[in-house]
C-alpha cells in the first residue's frame, strides 16, 4: 500500500566498525525522500536524517548512548515535495531494520601497532588503543575501555629471515616476547572478542618490521 509514487525502502543493513554505525538501504530515491527513526526495544522512536535523498544515515550518536542495548531502526518513504502525504492506511510507507546490538555486532576495526621496543632479548610490542565515539563522563572511551578483558589481541611475529611464525596473546594492549639477539622480526596483530559468535576477529594490522621507523632498539 501507500501512495502511487513512493516505494518502501528495502535491504536495510547496519554497517558498524568500532561503534561508528551507519544504516544503509535501497533504493536510490526517485521523486521521494526518506526519514529514519531509531529506538531501543523499550524506548521511544527518535527521528534522524529528516527528508533525506541519501540512502544511509549515521546513527552513531544514538547507539553510543548505550552500546549494550538492542536497537531497531525504520526508514520512512515520502513523496518528494509533499512530505505530508501518507499511504492509504494513513501513515507513510516504512520498513524495519534487523535488530542491532552494538556491543555484540560492531566490527572490530583494523588494529595498528603503535610501537615496539627491544631491550636485549625481549621486545615490547604496543597496540594502539583506538578511540571510539562512545562517551562516559564527557570523554571518549577507547576500545579497551569499552570491552575490557573481553578484547584480546593476537600477535603474529616472525624472523625477517624465515617464514615460521609464532603467536602470543594479551588482554591488555602490550606484548612482551622473547627474541633471538641480532635477528630482525616482523609483527602483525589481530583483535578478537572471545565471547562473540560472529564478527569475532578484526583484519590483521599492517605488518611492522624491526629496522624500520616505529621501533627502538636498546642493547642492554
Amino acid at each position: 500500500s501507500g501512495t502511487t509514487n513512493t516505494v518502501a525502502a528495502y535491504n536495510l543493513t547496519w554497517k558498524s566498525t568500532n561503534f561508528k554505525t551507519i544504516l544503509e538501504w535501497e533504493p536510490k530515491p526517485v521523486n521521494q525522500v526518506y526519514t529514519v527513526q531509531i529506538s531501543t526495544k523499550s524506548g521511544d522512536w527518535k527521528s534522524k536524517c529528516f527528508y533525506t535523498t541519501d540512502t544511509e544515515c549515521d546513527l552513531t550518536d544514538e547507539i553510543v548512548k548505550d552500546v549494550k542495548q538492542t536497537y531497531l531502526a525504520r526508514v520512512f518513504s515520502y513523496p518528494a515535495g509533499n512530505v505530508e502525504s501518507t499511504g492509504s492506511a494513513g501513515e507513510p510507507l516504512y520498513e524495519n531494520s534487523p535488530e542491532f546490538t552494538p556491543y555484540l555486532e560492531t566490527n572490530l576495526g583494523q588494529p595498528t601497532i603503535q610501537s615496539f621496543e627491544q631491550v636485549g632479548t625481549k621486545v615490547n610490542v604496543t597496540v594502539e588503543d583506538e578511540r571510539t565515539l562512545v562517551r562516559r563522563n564527557n570523554t571518549f572511551l577507547s576500545l579497551r575501555d569499552v570491552f575490557g578483558k573481553d578484547l584480546i589481541y593476537t600477535l603474529y611475529y616472525w624472523k625477517s629471515s624465515s617464514s615460521g611464525k609464532k603467536t602470543a596473546k594479551t588482554n591488555t594492549n602490550e606484548f612482551l616476547i622473547d627474541v633471538d639477539k641480532g635477528e630482525n622480526y616482523c609483527f602483525s596483530v589481530q583483535a578478537v572478542i572471545p565471547s562473540r559468535t560472529v564478527n569475532r576477529k578484526s583484519t590483521d594490522s599492517p605488518v611492522e618490521c624491526m629496522g624500520q621507523e616505529k621501533g627502538e632498539f636498546r642493547e642492554i
Epitope: 584480546i152 609464532k166 603467536t167 602470543a168 596473546k169
Partner: antibody, heavy 117, light 107 residues
Framework: QVQLVESGGGVVQPGRSLRLSCKAS????????MHWVRQAPGKGLEWIGL????????IYDPKFQGRFTISADNSKNTLFLQMDSLRPEDTAVYYC??????????WGQGTPVTVSS | DIQMTQSPSSLSASVGDRVTITCKAS??????LNWYQQKPGKAPKLLIY???SLADGVPSRFSGSGSGTDYTFTISSLQPEDIATYYC?????????FGQGTKLEIT
Amino acid sequence: QVQLVESGGGVVQPGRSLRLSCKASGFNIKDYYMHWVRQAPGKGLEWIGLIDPENGNTIYDPKFQGRFTISADNSKNTLFLQMDSLRPEDTAVYYCARDNSYYFDYWGQGTPVTVSS
Amino acid sequence: DIQMTQSPSSLSASVGDRVTITCKASQDIRKYLNWYQQKPGKAPKLLIYYATSLADGVPSRFSGSGSGTDYTFTISSLQPEDIATYYCLQHGESPYTFGQGTKLEIT
C-alpha cells in the same frame, strides 16, 4: 549445534603421507582459530599447530614445521592436516579443536593414525 | 619455548577427599592457563580457563588458582565420576604446551 568430526585416519607405512580432515558444523571456521592436537597411545596431549582460516595464518610447534601442514577450506567449513614423511612415533589419535581465544571450547572425537610397516 | 611441569603424574585419593594438582611454567604465562579432564577414549573436556574461571556447566567442586608461573587445580570433594586424567595447557604464546598429565584414581 557445534560439532567437529575428524576423518582420514588409518594405517600407513613409514615415509608415506596422510591427510586428515575435520568437518565443522554449527559455526563458521573462519570466525575462530582452529587447532590440531595429538595423543600417542598411553601418552599425554601434544599441540601440533593452529590456523586462522580467515587469512590462512598458520603457527606450528617447531617439531612439526615443514613436515605437517595445516590448511582450511572455508567454503566446505573444513580443516585439514597434511602429514608427510610419517614415522612410527607419529602413531596417535589426532584431534581438531576450536579456539575461542581463552580456551579450546569444542573438540572432535579424534581420528586414529597408525604408522607401521 | 615454555615448558609446563605438572605434578604429580598420578595420585590416588578417596571419595570426598580434597585433591590438588599443580602446574609450573618455565616463564610467566599471564594466567593463560586452562585445565582439562580426559576420560579414556574421549576428547578432553574444559574445566577451568584463564587460570581461575569455571567453564559453563562444570560443577563448583572444581576450581583453579594461580598467576605468573605457578598454578593449582583443586577438586574440593572428590566424586567417583572424577576418575580421569587431568591436563594443564598454556596458550599465552606458541608453541602451546600441555602438562604431562595427572592420572587420578580412587582408593
